[in-house]
Interface confidence: medium
């Protein structure tokens, strides 16, 4: 921002009424009126170019310093070319000297040269040559000097003529301030520019109404340079929650809008399924039946728990059940749906029921499922099972109601035995099998059926209470089809799959484990 100038003295604006002191009195400097651009202007002028040894002083009135530390002196003046005078005026000069003196009081007409300190010799960039003078072309020069730091109550300026033909048309003395400034939603007060050129005065800003320094952010600061310019902004303020930046201020969010944190972003429209917000809202409340999960951003629409899984099937396969379902028709507006499967088993004889999580095995953990199917195994035969699939999302925990669907299935058969070939010879096959331990108590006997491969007319059956059998009197180097089935009080259990086992050829005789 441009520096603000506070004028302490303005000769040109005073209309010749300042009454500056001349020394020696009545000689040298003289107040004159002229006409420029059809306007009367006043000037202090001296033109004793022929006399030699000039020492003419012009002193300003006493100027109250006020709060100024460094003053700037702007001079507008014209100097005639010494060659424009007859004989070149050998004693003629083309410069004058600028002085100042500080004091705590006005000395009035008591003028003492010794109190004055020289600021500089003032030389023109352009002198007024004869042709310009005759044509009334005033070659106006502008020079600026500065003095500081000033410490006394006031000061004088003085102009020493040493034999020039010079006219002072304007003497303006001012100091600079960094103007009041709003930047980055921070207010910086009007600040007096410092007196030392290299130094920058650090000025703390204050956040405008409804603005705050963001967490972890720097407090707003700026630097007021000696020329009255603000430099090096540091930190900033942001409009607080419920307010947005409009030009250089923070304005409350309009009804129906909200802003949930201090940020540079504008207010946002209330999302879906929220109630209309009042002015200055930091969030928008959810409609009845809709909720916001703790981790949901305020900009997200309010959501609700999902409906139940749309369609659930339970397909029994021996002592296993495959559960399949489709996603809820209403997701509640969320994508974070997970499923939980629970199991209940009932004994047909007694009608007694209880949880069965401990006795069954799931193909994957039954809680927090993201897929829409699961296989449950290790089910007991001749037992009724009820499976519940519950759909949940991020807001389900905020309500007491649950969204679930159930499917029941009766297990009538044991699980097919898993069959292994333990050993073989040219005339025998040793076979073993296993079934899940929970089902073993219900098995009365195991029935082993076997026949030559390719012979569909005859087969042999062996029954045993154990988990293995050796089949004898077999033909060498022959493939047999073997199946094992559990027998329960209620009837036959599920049969194993049919296995092909081959006896050894006579050349490779001897028992060999496989």
């Amino acid at each position: 921002a441009q520096g603000k100038e506070v004028v302490l003295l303005d000769f040109a604006a005073a209309g010749g009424e300042l009454g500056w002191l001349t020394h020696p009195y009545g000689k040298g400097w003289d107040l004159m009126q002229n006409i420029m651009n059809d306007m009367p202007i006043y000037m202090y002028s001296v033109c004793n170019v022929m006399s030699g040894d000039q020492d003419n002083w012009l002193r300003t009135n006493w100027v109250y310093r006020g709060e100024a530390e460094r003053i700037f002196i702007e001079l507008k003046f014209t100097v005639r070319d010494c060659n424009s005078f007859p004989g070149g005026a050998s004693s003629c000069k083309e410069t004058f000297n600028l002085y100042y003196a500080e004091s705590d009081l006005d000395y009035g007409t008591n003028f003492q040269k010794r109190l004055f300190t020289k600021i500089d010799t003032i030389a023109p960039d352009e002198i007024t040559v004869s042709s310009d003078f005759e044509a009334r072309h005033v070659k106006l020069n502008v020079e600026e000097r500065s003095v500081g730091p000033l410490t006394r109550k006031g000061f004088y300026l003085a102009f020493q003529d040493i034999g020039a033909c010079v006219a002072l048309l304007s003497v303006r003395v001012y100091y600079k301030k960094c103007p009041e400034l709003l930047q980055g939603l921070a207010h910086f007060p009007e600040t007096i520019a410092g007196s030392d050129a290299p130094s920058l005065a650090t000025v703390a800003g204050t956040c405008v109404d409804h603005a705050v320094v963001p967490p972890g952010g720097e407090e707003p600061r700026m630097h007021c340079a000696v020329d009255g310019e603000w430099l090096v902004p540091i930190g900033q303020c942001l409009c607080q929650a419920g307010y947005e930046k409009v030009e250089d201020a923070c304005q409350a969010c309009s009804p129906g809008f909200f802003k949930f944190e201090a940020s540079e972003s504008p207010c946002l429209e209330c999302p879906e399924h929220t109630l209309p917000s009042p002015e200055g809202a930091t969030s928008c409340e959810c409609e009845e039946g809709f909720f916001r999960a703790p981790q949901d951003p305020a900009s997200m629409p309010c959501t609700r728990p999902p409906s139940a899984p749309h369609y659930l099937t339970a397909v029994g396969m021996g002592a296993k059940v495959e559960l399949r379902w489709t996603p809820p028709q209403d997701s509640g507006g969320r994508e974070d749906i997970v499923y939980s499967v629970t199991c209940e088993q009932c004994w047909p004889e007694s009608g007694e029921c209880g949880p069965c999580e401990a006795s069954v095995r799931y193909s994957e953990p039954p809680h927090g499922l993201t897929r829409t199917s699961v296989t449950v195994s290790d089910l007991e035969p001749h037992m009724n099972y009820t499976f519940t699939v519950e759909a949940r999302n991020g807001v389900s925990g905020l309500v007491t109601s649950r969204s679930f669907r159930t499917a029941s299935v009766s297990i009538n058969q044991t699980e097919p035995p898993k069959v292994r070939l333990e050993g073989r010879s040219t005339t025998s096959l040793s076979v073993s099998w296993s079934i899940p331990p929970p089902q073993q108590s219900r098995v009365w006997k195991y029935e082993v059926t076997y026949r030559k491969k390719g012979d569909s007319n005859s087969y042999n059956v062996r029954r045993t209470e154990g988990f293995s059998v050796t089949l004898d009197d077999l033909a060498p180097d022959t493939t047999y089809l073997v199946q094992v089935q559990a027998l329960t009080q209620e009837g036959q259990g599920a049969g194993s799959k049919v296995h092909e086992f081959q006896t050894l050829s006579p050349e490779g005789s001897g028992n060999l484990a496989v």
Epitope: I35, P40, N48, S131
Partner: antibody, heavy 128, light 107 residues
Framework: EVQLLESGGGLVQPGGSLRLSCAAS????????MAWVRQAPGKGLEWVSR????????HYADSVKGRFTISRDNSKNTLYLQMNSLRAEDTAVYYC?????????????????????WGQGTLVTVSS | DIQMTQSPSSLSASVGDRVTITCRAS??????LAWYQQKPGKAPKLLIY???NLHTGVPSRFSGSGSGTEFTLTISSLQPDDFATYYC?????????FGQGTKVEIK
């Protein structure tokens, strides 16, 4: 010694024309502003026109504007006044006058000039 | 235009007298004023410029003063050669105007 010598005056009928000349010597003519000043018989002085050292700018009194033309030839050290559409009230002694700003010890020139040097004058009579 | 009014229009004085002639401007002309002396049948001669500056070769008994609208020409001790008509002229405006003249006669 500065000398200004006017010529070209005489009797002329109303509506007629006349050209006055002023021969300069004894000074650097091209440094001087030159002017014509007239004086009606038994009356005071009246400024007529001026011309800058190098031929411009020119200014005229309202009473002669559009009828009189001032000019100069610095190579001949001569000032001229061409007078057209003459009227009876133009009857006067016409003086040529000069001003050298180099002798005026002021930092800023006056808005206009005064007259340091004068010729002896030439009489112009406009009559039918 | 700026009007210049001289007073008196004529005066009678004796050799050795102090003579003062006044010139008034219709508006402020600062110090842009000149005084001339004219004898019958002769061209005017410059006496004073810039209200108070004596032209080269003019006797020091002549002096000028004033600024703004009021100006005076003073002859401190009238000499026989001083009997003439005196004119003031303003040169603040390009339409330079003269006063109507003051005739100084022998008493």
């Amino acid at each position: 010694e500065v000398q200004l010598l006017e010529s070209g005056g005489g009797l002329v009928q109303p509506g007629g024309s006349l050209r006055l000349s002023c021969a300069a010597s004894g000074f650097t003519f091209s440094h001087y502003m030159m002017a014509w000043v007239r004086q009606a018989p038994g009356k005071g002085l009246e400024w007529v026109s001026r011309i800058g050292p190098s031929g411009g700018p020119t200014h005229y009194a309202d009473s002669v504007k559009g009828r009189f033309t001032i000019s100069r030839d610095n190579s001949k050290n001569t000032l001229y006044l061409q007078m057209n559409s003459l009227r009876a009230e133009d009857t006067a002694v016409y003086y040529c006058a000069g001003y050298d700003s180099g002798y005026d010890y002021v930092a800023v020139a006056g808005p206009a000039e005064y007259f340091q040097h004068w010729g002896q004058g030439t009489l112009v009579t406009v009559s039918s | 235009d700026i009007q210049m009014t001289q007073s008196p229009s004529s005066l009678s004085a004796s050799v050795g007298d102090r003579v003062t002639i006044t010139c008034r401007a219709s508006q402020s002309i600062s110090t842009w004023l000149a005084w001339y002396q004219q004898k019958p049948g002769k061209a005017p001669k410059l006496l004073i410029y810039k209200a108070s500056n004596l032209h080269t070769g003019v006797p020091s008994r002549f002096s000028g003063s004033g600024s703004g609208t009021e100006f005076t020409l003073t002859i401190s001790s009238l000499q026989p050669d001083d009997f003439a008509t005196y004119y003031c002229q303003q040169y603040q405006s390009y339409s330079r105007t003269f006063g109507q003249g003051t005739k100084v006669e022998i008493k």
